[in-house]
């Protein structure tokens, strides 16, 4: 089966999250700095004529690009979009930011910057004070905080106001930790890396963050082309060669927000075996509640049979049996010269009772709605009242 | 630069506040740490104040310590002192995109619990 | 909770000689590590960082090496400036869930 059964649609995780209809409260709108009270974080918000009309930093946002305005979602969010405006005051304001940069961080201890997939943290923003310009974030970021760090070319006022679109990232996935992605030499180079990865990279390994195994675009069957515009070969994957593993197998790790019971992966892999790609022959799993216990009982184990000669990119089911956990380590065993992976997802429930992981003194903050519903592996937020998504832009995933 | 003070002579179970004071950066973009030494001892690990308000400590700490922090200083309050809190307490200053090591360190200020 | 065992805990050696110092994990640190000197009666000094890193203005004659549970500073063409106590400190991080650091005990360097 290709399908991934429940898995989330990035195309309709697009939701206004909060900052025009107050849902998100003031208490979680800061700033580095504000002009005046009368410009102060609270009034950033996108339509809004609150205050002055804007937020403003007290600072000059030139040369040094370091005032900010930051939005707590309290919650992990995959953010797909951003809207911006200057500062109107009913066409007294002239004030506004031709060019900004974002940073997120899922526990407001790590920041990330956000690039695009060219590698480019810098995005094009206003050209007036009373314009709303959407930035599609290709690729998205899963955040509970994010900050907006306007820039200048020059000494100068500048000014926000802003919305985030995006949904609940209910998967729980923080981060997951893998060998790097190699290239495969065809008649082309295909780049099999996680080319949006946003954690460290420190001898051949990858660990703390999330990319492309975790950002709902799955991969077509020939690995060599892409759902992306303007990439290069295997962009889709993450990709294996078993020359590199003389242990037979990769191996994984994936930490999660809280202790969930763990019904079954499911990863979606590349079949294309005349080009060496093959599903993996066996997954070997092993699970603990916390990052410094001992791996719990027996590795569930499961050997992948089926349709093997059929070339096409499908989704493998990895059953794991309720089993408790916090953190969970993978061994993809090689069936062939290739293991080429482009999501990798989980169908789990949170465990009663089980307060989030996000230790520390953080403002509490309700980690699910009143009576968590099992996530029932959908990271998409049940559709809000009354609201409808934002479209994306035609023929342009990442406009 | 960063600074500490407040550091001086305390009974057991007097409420003591030390300041860590920083200028020439701002704490809305670094994280600061907490670190204390006993007379002739190494070093010690007490928490951090992230620049996003959130506070973690060391497992020993909790419940001993309370970190908080305002546009330029992060106090660290020792809750309940005892003896074994005599020590120096140092102000840190994290990495800007490198939350794993302490780059900037203030001189120290002086605790001493003794009745 | 993040232990860091280091060893040992004094060494001595001559003016333009070698010191080893090791330093080990509880947990895997993936190269969250840092070294310090201390002198006495000053603050630590940051020797390297990201295990292996130096910060501008310190010598190369420090080398950090080391990944996982296991790292180690080399100090080379010893001189008598060196003569001071030496801390590693590790990070235990995972994805946004758990942060905890940890000193070693110190390593006493006596420069003959």
């Known amino acids: 089966d290709a399908d991934m059964k429940g898995h989330f649609d990035p195309a309709k995780c697009r939701y206004a999250l909060g900052m025009q209809d107050r849902t998100i409260p003031d208490s979680d709108i800061s700033a580095s700095s504000s002009w005046s009270d009368s410009t102060a974080a609270r009034h950033s918000r996108l339509e809004s004529s609150d205050g002055d009309g804007a937020w403003c930093p007290a600072g000059s946002v030139f040369p040094k690009e370091e005032e900010y305005l930051q939005v707590d979602l309290q919650r992990l969010h995959l953010v797909a979009l951003v809207g911006t405006q200057g500062r109107h005051a009913g066409g007294l304001g002239k004030e506004f930011s031709r060019s900004y940069r974002l940073r997120y961080s899922r526990d407001g201890r790590r920041w990330m910057g956000w690039k695009d997939r060219w590698g480019q943290e810098v995005i094009s923003g206003n050209e007036d004070p009373e314009g709303v310009v959407l930035k599609d974030l290709g690729p998205p970021m899963v955040a509970r905080l994010v900050r907006f760090y306007p820039r200048a070319d020059r000494v100068m006022s500048v000014c926000l106001r802003v919305e985030l679109y995006g949904c609940l990232w209910r998967d729980g996935l923080l981060s997951y930790t893998a060998p790097v992605g190699q290239t495969m030499y065809l008649s082309e180079a295909v780049y099999l890396n996680d080319s949006t990865y946003d954690g460290h990279t420190v001898g051949g390994l990858q660990y703390g963050g999330l990319g492309q195994l975790a950002d709902g675009v799955v991969g077509l069957d020939d690995f060599r082309k892409s759902q992306e515009l303007r990439v290069w070969p295997g962009y889709d994957y993450v990709g294996w060669s078993n020359h590199s593993f003389s242990s037979g197998y990769v191996e994984m790790e994936f930490e999660f927000d809280r202790l969930r019971a763990f019904q079954a992966m499911q990863v979606h892999c590349n079949n294309m075996h005349t080009l060496g790609a093959r599903l993996p022959g066996g997954v070997e799993c092993r699970f603990r509640r916390g990052p410094a216990m001992a791996w719990e009982g027996e590795p569930m184990r499961h050997n992948l049979g089926g349709n093997l000669g059929d070339p096409r990119a499908r989704a493998v089911s990895v059953p794991l049996g309720g089993r408790v956990a916090r953190f969970l380590q993978c061994r993809f065993l090689f069936a062939g010269p290739w293991l080429l992976f482009s999501e990798i997802s989980f169908i789990s429930d949170v465990v009663n009772n089980s307060s989030p992981a996000l230790g520390g003194t953080f403002p509490p903050a309700p980690w699910w709605p009143p009576g968590p519903p099992p996530t029932n592996f959908s990271s998409l937020e049940l559709e809000p009242r009354g609201q409808q998504p934002v479209a994306k832009a035609e023929g342009s995933p990442t406009a | 630069s960063v600074e500490e003070s407040g550091g001086r002579l305390v009974t057991p179970g007097g409420s003591l506040t030390l300041t860590c004071t920083v200028s020439?950066?701002?704490?809305?973009?670094?994280?600061m740490s907490w670190v204390r030494q006993a007379p002739g001892k190494g070093l010690e690990w007490i928490g951090i104040?992230?620049?996003?308000?959130f506070v973690d400590y060391a497992s020993w700490a909790k419940g001993r310590f309370s970190i908080s922090k305002t546009s330029t200083t992060v106090d660290l309050k020792i809750t309940s002192p005892t003896t074994e809190d005599t020590a120096t307490y140092f102000c840190?200053?994290?990495?800007?995109?490198?939350?794993?090591?302490?780059?900037?360190w203030g001189p120290g200020t002086l605790v001493t619990i003794s009745s | 909770e993040l232990v860091m065992t280091q060893t040992p805990a004094s060494v001595e050696a001559a003016v333009g000689g070698t010191v080893t110092i090791k330093c080990q994990a509880s947990?895997?640190?993936?190269?969250?590590l840092a070294w310090y000197q201390q002198k006495p009666g000053q603050p630590p000094k940051l020797l390297i960082y990201?295990?292996?890193k130096l910060p501008s203005g310190v010598p190369s004659r420090f080398k950090g090496t080391g990944s996982g549970t296991e790292y180690t500073l080399t100090i080379s063409d010893l001189e008598c400036a060196d003569a001071a106590t030496y801390y590693c400190?590790?990070?235990?991080?995972?994805?946004?869930?758990?942060?905890?650091?940890?000193f070693g005990g110190g390593t006493e360097v006596v420069v003959k």
């Open positions: 947990e895997t640190i993936s190269s969250r």
């Open positions: 104040s992230w620049n996003s308000g």
């Open positions: 400190q590790g990070c235990y991080y995972g994805g946004g869930s758990f942060y905890d650091s940890a």
């Open positions: 990201q295990a292996s």
């Open positions: 020439g950066f701002s704490l809305s973009s670094y994280d």
């Open positions: 840190a200053r994290l990495g800007a995109d490198d939350i794993y090591y302490f780059n900037l």
